[in-house]
């Protein structure tokens, strides 16, 4: 059941990113580190970079509440088992600052791409009976 919940959480994050993409014009147009083409075993490290990025509401429109709630939900910490797996390869993974910086629209697109990849990896690891994803 934990594995199913994990998958639900990852898919929920994809939906949150989709919702935020509707509000790109209401986000601070700041350039943020946006991992792309993340190498195998560095997915959790890249995920952490996306979570650390200072995505912010521009506080200009009426969508400030939903934007702030969504951003905060994107930063929900995965459990320590996943954090442990993240750490396993942290020495060989690029630092957050080394990734190309992109404006919010591309940042969110790349975040979604990573989440899709992690979701597929999780599915295939379950199919092959592995618990290590």
């Amino acid at each position: 059941q934990g594995q199913d919940r994990h998958m639900i959480r990852m898919r929920q994050l994809i939906d949150i990113v989709d919702q935020l993409k509707n509000y790109v014009n209401d986000l601070v147009p700041e350039f943020l580190p946006a991992p792309e083409d993340v190498e195998t075993n560095c997915e959790w490290s890249a995920f952490s970079c996306f979570q650390k990025a200072q995505l912010k509401s521009a506080n200009t429109g009426n969508n400030e509440r939903i934007i702030n709630v969504s951003i905060k939900k994107l930063k929900r910490k995965p459990p320590s088992t996943n954090a442990g797996r993240r750490q396993k390869h942290r020495l060989t993974c690029p630092s957050c600052d080394s990734y190309e910086k992109k404006p919010p629209k591309e940042f969110l697109e790349r975040f979604k791409s990573l989440l899709d990849k992690m979701d597929h990896q999780h599915l295939s690891s379950r199919t092959h009976g592995s618990e290590d994803s």
Partner: antibody, heavy 126, light 106 residues
Framework: QVQLVESGGGVVQPGRSLRLSCAAS????????MHWVRQAPGKGLEWVAF????????YYADSVKGRFTISRDNSKNTLYLQMNSLRAEDTAVYYC???????????????????WGQGTTVTVSS | EIVLTQSPGTLSLSPGERATLSCRAS???????LAWYQQKPGQAPRLLIY???SRATGIPDRFSGSGSGTDFTLTISRLEPEDFAVYYC???????FGQGTKVEIK
């Protein structure tokens, strides 16, 4: 069982204050965001306020901003709504509701209000 | 801020009939963010559907939700006597409710 019980409603004059309470039981209160929602007589539902599970963020409807304050005491499993400068248009049944999206990664994941109290009536009248 | 418009305002049907309730958003809503509630007179609302199409715990399978973008639908396949109530859609995160659709006995 999972339960929310509101209290503190009553009749109050315009401009006065009132504090509503919502006692939670049957679940880990500190893992859930909480809402206040109201319903004026014969009208629809109106969201009033939300507080994050740890109290770190609070959000308010424009109609109550600056007058109402949502707070919580996780050690007492209780949610509060402090209502100041009350107006006739604040007359309503006030419900507390649990946000269905738990802070726990493996917890509940509903984007909705999944548990509701029975409501407490607030009447603002001179 | 997003506005949710529900239609029709009132739906007059007989038990056993199919009810189709509409909720239209003024801006695109990610399906995870759309919920439906049922409220009977003198009672608190009850969560029926979350994520546009997932039934909440204990909700009978005659209730189903669908839709994406700006158009969402709640369908009750065969109305039972206890289903006559007011139904609200809601956008999560802004927590805006639609104005409600009353399903009444014809």
């Amino acid at each position: 069982q999972v339960q929310l019980v509101e209290s503190g409603g009553g009749v109050v004059q315009p401009g006065r204050s009132l504090r509503l309470s919502c006692a939670a039981s049957g679940f880990t209160f500190s893992s859930y965001g909480m809402h206040w929602v109201r319903q004026a007589p014969g009208k629809g539902l109106e969201w009033v306020a939300f507080i994050w599970y740890d109290g770190s963020d609070k959000y308010y409807a424009d109609s109550v901003k600056g007058r109402f304050t949502i707070s919580r005491d996780n050690s007492k499993n209780t949610l509060y709504l402090q209502m100041n400068s009350l107006r006739a248009e604040d007359t309503a049944v006030y419900y507390c509701a649990r946000d269905g999206d738990s802070s726990d990664w493996y917890g509940d994941y509903y984007f909705g209000m999944d548990v509701w109290g029975q409501g407490t009536t607030v009447t603002v009248s001179s | 801020e997003i506005v949710l418009t529900q239609s029709p305002g009132t739906l007059s049907l007989s038990p056993g009939e199919r009810a189709t309730l509409s909720c239209r958003a003024s801006q695109s809503v990610s399906s995870s963010y759309l919920a439906w509630y049922q409220q009977k007179p003198g009672q608190a609302p009850r969560l029926l559907i979350y994520g546009a199409s997932s039934r909440a715990t204990g909700i009978p399978d005659r209730f189903s939700g669908s839709g994406s973008g700006t158009d969402f639908t709640l369908t009750i396949s065969r109305l039972e006597p206890e289903d006559f109530a007011v139904y609200y859609c809601q956008q999560y995160g802004s927590w805006t409710f639609g104005q409600g659709t009353k399903v009444e006995i014809k």
